[in-house]
């Protein structure tokens, strides 16, 4: 997995008038890292993990950069011509990556009302846009503004590729995120499903990186995909991830089933707990 830094900026307009507030979220290696969500932006680390990466310092630099970015995006939204009445949003997502071979990738994507209309490869400076006429119109609009305003808005649009990578390298220097491996905690629970059946759920939490294999096996053989229900792999707010898998089995056959977990080259199997069936909310409807 490459190391990545992802900026997600959102600004709003109401009845054609651009709102003063904006929302900025920054993800480092796929984890929520920084956030600005008030009229007056104050960069807030998302959890202890982010504080550890940033070290013992104020976040003035991040706050300044994110505030500048927000202002620039508000100006861009103001230049979009087809502002109909009601609420509209302009979103910019900027991502830069450093791969294991030290190669880099950077891109920028614009969304209007949640719909992608313009992308740029920040290394080749190549622009791409969807085929729809609405997207094309928006894209031309925004590209023209960015060209015109390139000098004025250099805080945001000048050397974005370099700036993003510079920040990413700075964060990586902390050592906190560098190729760390945190093994998951695995927990198996059971709940009554229907007459003679129980639902068994296997939860893995607190692991990093996010790639994990979690599945149910019967006597050592994987159950087919369509007999299992998987949860998404989600950040748990501590710089680590969580997920789950569930299946329905016959009561009395619990000892035949194990939850198989594989993460970062390590694996383990986890039996279904025996004893009294706990009545829990089932994942299966």
């Amino acid at each position: 997995e490459p190391h990545s830094l992802r900026y997600n900026l959102t600004v709003l307009s109401w009845d054609g008038s651009v709102q003063s507030g904006f929302l900025t979220e920054v993800h480092l290696d796929g984890q929520p890292f920084l956030r600005c969500d008030r009229q007056k932006c104050r960069a807030k680390p998302q959890g202890q993990w982010a504080e550890d990466v940033l070290g013992n310092k104020t976040w003035d630099r991040e706050t300044r950069d994110l505030t500048g970015n927000g202002k620039d995006l508000r100006m861009t939204l103001a230049h979009i011509k087809d502002q109909k009445e009601g609420l509209h949003s302009l979103q910019e997502i900027r991502v830069c990556e450093i791969h294991e071979d030290n190669s880099t990738r950077s891109s920028q994507h614009f969304y209007y009302d949640g719909e992608l209309f313009l992308s740029q490869n920040l290394e080749t400076k190549e622009w791409t846009m969807p085929q729809s006429s609405r997207a094309q119109t928006l894209a031309m609009n925004v590209r023209n503004f960015l060209k015109e305003d390139a000098m004025k808005t250099k805080t945001h649009y000048h050397a974005m590729h370099a700036d993003c990578l510079q920040e990413l390298r700075r964060y990586l220097k902390s050592g906190v995120v560098l190729r760390r491996t945190v093994p998951p905690m695995v927990n198996v629970t059971r709940s009554e499903a229907s007459e003679g059946n129980i639902t068994v759920t296997c939860r893995a939490s607190g692991f990093y990186p996010w790639n994990i294999t979690l599945s149910w096996r019967q006597d050592g053989v994987s159950l087919s995909h369509d007999t299992q229900q998987w949860g998404d792999v989600l950040p748990d707010g501590n710089g680590t991830y969580q997920t789950w898998v569930a299946t329905r089995i016959c009561q009395g056959e619990e000892q035949r089933f194990t939850c198989y977990m594989e993460h970062s080259g390590n694996h383990s199997t986890h039996p279904v707990p025996s004893g009294k069936v706990l009545v829990l909310q089932s994942h299966w409807q």
Partner: antibody, heavy 122, light 106 residues
Framework: QVQLQESGGGLVQLGGSMKLSCGAS????????MNWVRQAPGKGLEWISY????????YYADSVKGRFTISRDNARNSLYLQMNSLRAEDTALYYC???????????????WGQGTMVTVSS | DIQLTQSPSSLSASVGDRVTITCRAS??????LNWYQQKPGKAPKLLIY???SLQSGVPSRFSGSGSGTDFTLTISSLQPEDFATYYC????????FGGGTKVDIK
């Protein structure tokens, strides 16, 4: 005692069909996953199909996918293999085999039948 | 699909010899590996499951080891009844057998 007995083998024409059966006795058949494994004359073992106890997980080897169908009838303690579009290379001794239920098992086959011979002729 | 490669494909040994058969998987299968013995005209018999666990009723001269991609079946002191063909089998991803190793009398 615990036993598996295959039947239904014999001579069949190229492109023809045949259905094999495997009768189980001496254990609770409905609790066990089952397999079909074949062995061509003078060759090694080839796993061809798996079905779990509830028939909701079924796997096939690529060599038989789309032509063979595994099924079971827990009330009759029986396992079946429907073979269609038979080819010369399907000529083999066909075994049914039970997946062990021992704790910590890794899909091992602990009980095997004696096999039934299928010969596909042109 | 995962391929299992057994080596050697055949070997000659004498009663009392220590015999080692290897099975290599095309990718890591952790410990999802089993070993079988088959004598001519007979059905296969399970010897070892989970790479190293001895099946009930199997003599202790048989042992299994390995994890990941490389596995070994060892017969510490070959007995007359051990001349047979040995197969490895994995269940990590679907199911497959190795090509077999025939152990005959030197």
């Amino acid at each position: 005692q615990v036993q598996l007995q295959e039947s239904g083998g014999g001579l069949v024409q190229l492109g023809g069909s045949m259905k094999l059966s495997c009768g189980a006795s001496g254990f609770t058949f409905s609790s066990y996953s089952m397999n079909w494994v074949r062995q061509a004359p003078g060759k090694g073992l080839e796993w061809i199909s798996y079905i779990n106890s509830r028939s909701n997980t079924i796997y096939y080897a690529d060599s038989v996918k789309g032509r063979f169908t595994i099924s079971r009838d827990n009330a009759r303690n029986s396992l079946y293999l429907q073979m269609n579009s038979l080819r010369a290379e399907d000529t083999a001794l066909y075994y049914c085999a039970r997946v062990s239920s021992v704790t910590g098992n890794t899909g091992a086959f602990d009980i095997w039948g004696q096999g039934t011979m299928v010969t596909v002729s042109s | 699909d995962i391929q299992l490669t057994q080596s050697p494909s055949s070997l000659s040994a004498s009663v009392g010899d220590r015999v080692t058969i290897t099975c290599r998987a095309s990718q890591s299968i952790h410990n999802y590996l089993n070993w079988y013995q088959q004598k001519p005209g007979k059905a296969p018999k399970l010897l070892i499951y989970a790479a190293s666990s001895l099946q009930s009723g199997v003599p202790s001269r048989f042992s299994g080891s390995g994890s990941g991609t490389d596995f070994t079946l060892t017969i510490s002191s070959l007995q007359p009844e051990d001349f047979a063909t040995y197969y490895c089998q994995q269940s990590y991803s679907i199911l497959t057998f190795g090509g077999g190793t025939k152990v005959d009398i030197k």
